[in-house]
């Protein structure tokens, strides 16, 4: 899978709609373990004025809470600013708006810097097709296979989707 390493040709609007989280990776394993701050799941996305709006599902007390977040555009085309558990530089690494999206975040929380990557797909039945691309991006940015968590249906708040 050859990614274009930039925002989709037709613009961010092509990213709008439903998405499913498939895999997470981090250089700090606690962040993506159950109840980790970045063990969150995409529900849907929309784009407006160059900014990305996402509804994410956060497991809490056996339930899943839907939270809306906005990643604000920057002067760099594939980079966004996101405030979530500190400050995040959010990058779109590989984008095929009809199929899959790989993003990674460099998170700054107090004096701690962390790296988190996220694979999401349009169609969960095709998730296996895009795991190699995710592994490749992770390897490229310095995350190894043993730092990747592939999510199961139980993990990703499937019951909370309307």
């Amino acid at each position: 899978q050859e990614g274009n390493h930039e925002e989709p040709q037709g613009g961010l609007e092509e990213l709008s709609g439903r998405w499913h989280s498939v895999a997470l990776a981090s250089n700090k394993s606690d962040l993506i373990k159950p109840w980790g701050h970045f063990r969150v799941f995409i529900h849907s996305m929309s784009a407006k004025d160059g900014n990305l709006h996402g509804d994410i599902l956060i497991p809490q007390d056996g339930q899943c809470e839907k939270v809306s977040l906005t990643a604000f555009k920057t002067a760099t085309s594939n980079k966004f600013d996101l405030e979530y558990w500190g400050h995040n530089d959010l990058y779109l690494a590989e984008v095929d708006p009809k199929s899959y999206l790989i993003l990674y975040m460099i998170n700054q929380y107090n004096d701690d810097t962390s790296l988190v990557a996220h694979l999401m797909v349009r169609d969960l039945s095709r998730q296996q097709d895009f795991l190699p691309a995710f592994e490749s991006v992770c390897e490229d940015i310095g995350l190894h296979k043993d730092q990747i968590v592939v999510l199961s249906d139980d993990d990703r708040c499937q019951g909370s989707r309307d």
Epitope: N27, Y104, L115, D140, G142
Partner: nanobody, 121 residues
Framework: AVQLVDSGGGLVQAGDSLRLSCVAS????????MGWFRQAPGKERLIVAT????????HYADSVEGRFTISRDNAKNTVYLQMNSLEPEDTAVYYC??????????????WGQGTQVTVSS
């Protein structure tokens, strides 16, 4: 062990440009994420920019974003730092080193000799 040779520094005026180079020995260069750091007099060594193994993904410190560009040529075992619109605050010794990932966490203590950049106002 990885050996690194930094070059390209100099004395320039504010607003000028410089291009730093760092050549790494060894055949495993392309298996490392690389980073440029800088250390101003009396200050700690801070990350400036990082670049992924393939060279397609990068990350910059806020203070240099939009002015500096990191790139690499894996065939030449070289990483570059193009520095534009230089400011007196950019004065420091610049070092490149392999890092664990794009956040710039260092891998051991591999440092070159550094290259001095001095920006006068």
């Amino acid at each position: 062990a990885v050996q690194l040779v930094d070059s390209g520094g100099g004395l320039v005026q504010a607003g000028d440009s410089l291009r730093l180079s760092c050549v790494a020995s060894g055949r495993t260069f392309s298996s490392y994420v690389m980073g440029w750091f800088r250390q101003a007099p009396g200050k700690e060594r801070l990350i400036v920019a990082t670049i992924s193994k393939s060279g397609s993904l990068t990350h910059y410190a806020d203070s240099v974003e939009g002015r500096f560009t990191i790139s690499r040529d894996n065939a030449k075992n070289t990483v570059y730092l193009q520095m534009n619109s230089l400011e007196p605050e950019d004065t420091a010794v610049y070092y490149c080193t392999p890092v664990s990932d794009l956040t710039g966490r260092r891998l051991g203590s591999y440092w070159g000799q550094g290259t001095q950049v001095t920006v006068s106002s």
